[in-house]
Interface confidence: medium
């Protein structure tokens, strides 16, 4: 039986002045960015709500956030797309200053949910901003996390040509199969349109000199992606900060030497 | 010369009424994202609306300005307004106007001198 | 909406000297925050946006860092127009932008 009182969830509630921030984000990435000013964010806000509104948090489908992500269709060019695992800060740092890659953070649909939590109430129009359910405590199918299951799945389908991935070296896992990027991104990967996957593993410590591309779950990485027939390549980041200052300024002379 | 320049404020009695305007020159108005952005005498900066680019079709506030201030713009004039209702004492301060860069990023790089606004009775 | 908090307040510095301002946020902004300079009765002047980025026509002497909630402001070496008032802004999570309180560099 599905609850009438207002539920009583484990996470925190949908972030404040919601409805503003999306809308508000939806005007300013249209009209920056050229390709997408046909776009109306008011229809992008009732495809967003149509989503979750009067549902029952813990029953949210890929199948309701389908008219969002028809309106929010964008293609990103061959060559240009960058995944990221746990070490988001830096990959949009990354993106940045490097504006001819994309993160889904840097695509509409990831600009306008980036940070932000939602869920609604089975059977009112109300948005709950007490509380919504938690992945691991209430529930996975919750809002939040079946968007970013979905829009995470329609962009790594999109990819083509050489895709990038930042992974984070200081973890005990740098490929976790549990992260949105090793089940969802990797196994949406399309082999006809994606010739390699390359990871670039972000060293943590200053005097980490060790080569992390060895590391079991990166040889575990490997498999998967070789077994789709997409071949896989790895680089060590050993110097995050130069790494961005490089980018920035690629003809400094210490740019030439290992980063 | 890209340049904005306020004009409209003035002294004005509680609950009166003042409309500001800021002159565009240099660049094309209408590709721009505009604010207001004011500082009351010896405080710091506080934002106060904003306007999308072309027709103005979505306009933003600040919660203490709500439901009072209404930005516009007119870019046939190359100007943008701010009409402000039912002035309180705490709305005394410099407005200036500020454009945004049109970039993927949303910072203000160019501001106009500013124009005073006194709310005193 | 998201609170920056400047620091210091006032930092009192001689000509020559480096100057270091910080800006920390209630919350992650990635890197959309945007330092301005502003001397008595003049209008804000940007500096730096995109946290690290130089407006144009800004001398090189002044430099952004950071990303996330901590961000910095650095002058390398003082010049007597440098003093002045400095406010970071963040254009991350908006309606409203928000701008810290300020901090004033004076001449020690």
């Known amino acids: 039986v599905l609850p009438r009182w207002r539920q009583q969830w484990s996470g925190s509630g949908t972030t404040s002045r919601f409805p503003e921030t999306v809308l508000a984000r939806c005007v300013k990435y249209t009209e920056v960015h050229p390709e997408m000013r046909h776009v109306d964010c008011q229809s992008v806000w009732d495809a967003f709500k149509g989503a979750f509104i009067s549902k029952y948090p813990c029953n949210i489908t890929e199948e309701d956030y389908q008219p969002l992500v028809k309106l929010g269709t964008q293609t990103v060019p061959c060559n240009k797309t960058l995944l990221w695992s746990r070490i988001k800060d830096l990959a949009h740092q990354f993106t940045q200053v490097q504006r001819d890659m994309f993160t889904l953070e840097d695509m509409l649909l990831g600009y306008l949910a980036d940070d932000l939590t939602w869920c609604g109430e089975f059977n009112t129009f109300e948005i709950n901003y007490q509380s919504c359910p938690d992945w691991r405590k209430d529930c996975s199918n919750n809002p939040v996390s079946v968007f970013w299951k979905t829009v995470s799945r329609r962009f790594a389908e999109t990819a083509c040509g050489v895709v990038h991935v930042m992974l984070n070296g200081s973890r005990s896992k740098i490929f976790d199969k549990n992260s949105t990027f090793g089940s969802v991104e990797v196994h949406n990967l399309q082999p006809e349109k994606v010739q390699a996957l390359e990871a670039w593993v972000i060293h943590g410590g200053r005097e980490d000199s060790r080569d992390l591309c060895q590391d079991p779950t990166i040889k575990e990485l490997e498999s998967i992606i070789s077994k789709r027939n997409i071949r896989f390549f790895c680089k060590n980041i050993y110097r995050p900060d130069k790494f961005l200052q490089c980018v920035k300024n690629p003809e400094d002379s210490s740019c030439l030497s290992g980063i | 010369e890209v340049q904005l320049l306020e004009s409209g404020g003035g002294f004005v009695q509680p609950g009166g009424s003042l409309r500001l305007s800021c002159a565009a020159s240099?660049?094309?108005?209408?590709?721009?994202?505009m604010n207001w952005v004011r500082q009351a005498p010896g405080k710091g900066l506080e934002w106060v609306s904003s306007i999308s680019i072309s027709g103005g079709r979505y306009t933003w506030y600040a919660d203490s300005v709500k439901g009072r201030f209404t930005i516009s713009r007119d870019n046939s004039r190359n100007t943008l307004y701010l009409q402000m209702n039912s002035l309180r004492a705490e709305d005394t301060a410099i407005y200036y106007c500020?454009?945004?860069?049109?970039?993927?990023?949303?910072?203000?790089?160019?501001w106009g001198q500013g124009t005073t606004v006194t709310v005193s009775s | 909406e998201i609170v920056l908090t400047q620091s210091p307040g006032t930092l009192s510095l001689s000509p020559g000297e480096r100057a270091t301002l910080n800006c920390r946020a209630s919350?992650?902004?990635?890197?959309?925050l945007a330092w301005y300079q502003q001397k008595p009765g003049q209008a804000p002047r940007l500096l730096i946006y995109?946290?690290?980025n130089r407006a144009t026509g800004i001398p090189d002497r002044f430099s952004g860092s950071g990303s996330g909630t901590d961000f910095s402001l650095t002058i390398s070496r003082l010049e007597p127009e440098d003093f002045a008032v400095y406010y970071c802004?963040?254009?991350?999570?908006?309606?409203?932008?928000?701008f810290g309180g300020g901090t004033k560099v004076e001449i020690k």
């Open positions: 919350q992650n902004v990635r890197s959309d």
């Open positions: 500020a454009r945004e860069m049109n970039t993927y990023s949303f910072p203000m790089d160019v």
């Open positions: 995109d946290a690290s």
């Open positions: 240099g660049f094309t108005f209408t590709n721009y994202v």
């Open positions: 802004q963040q254009y991350y999570d908006w309606p409203p932008y928000t």
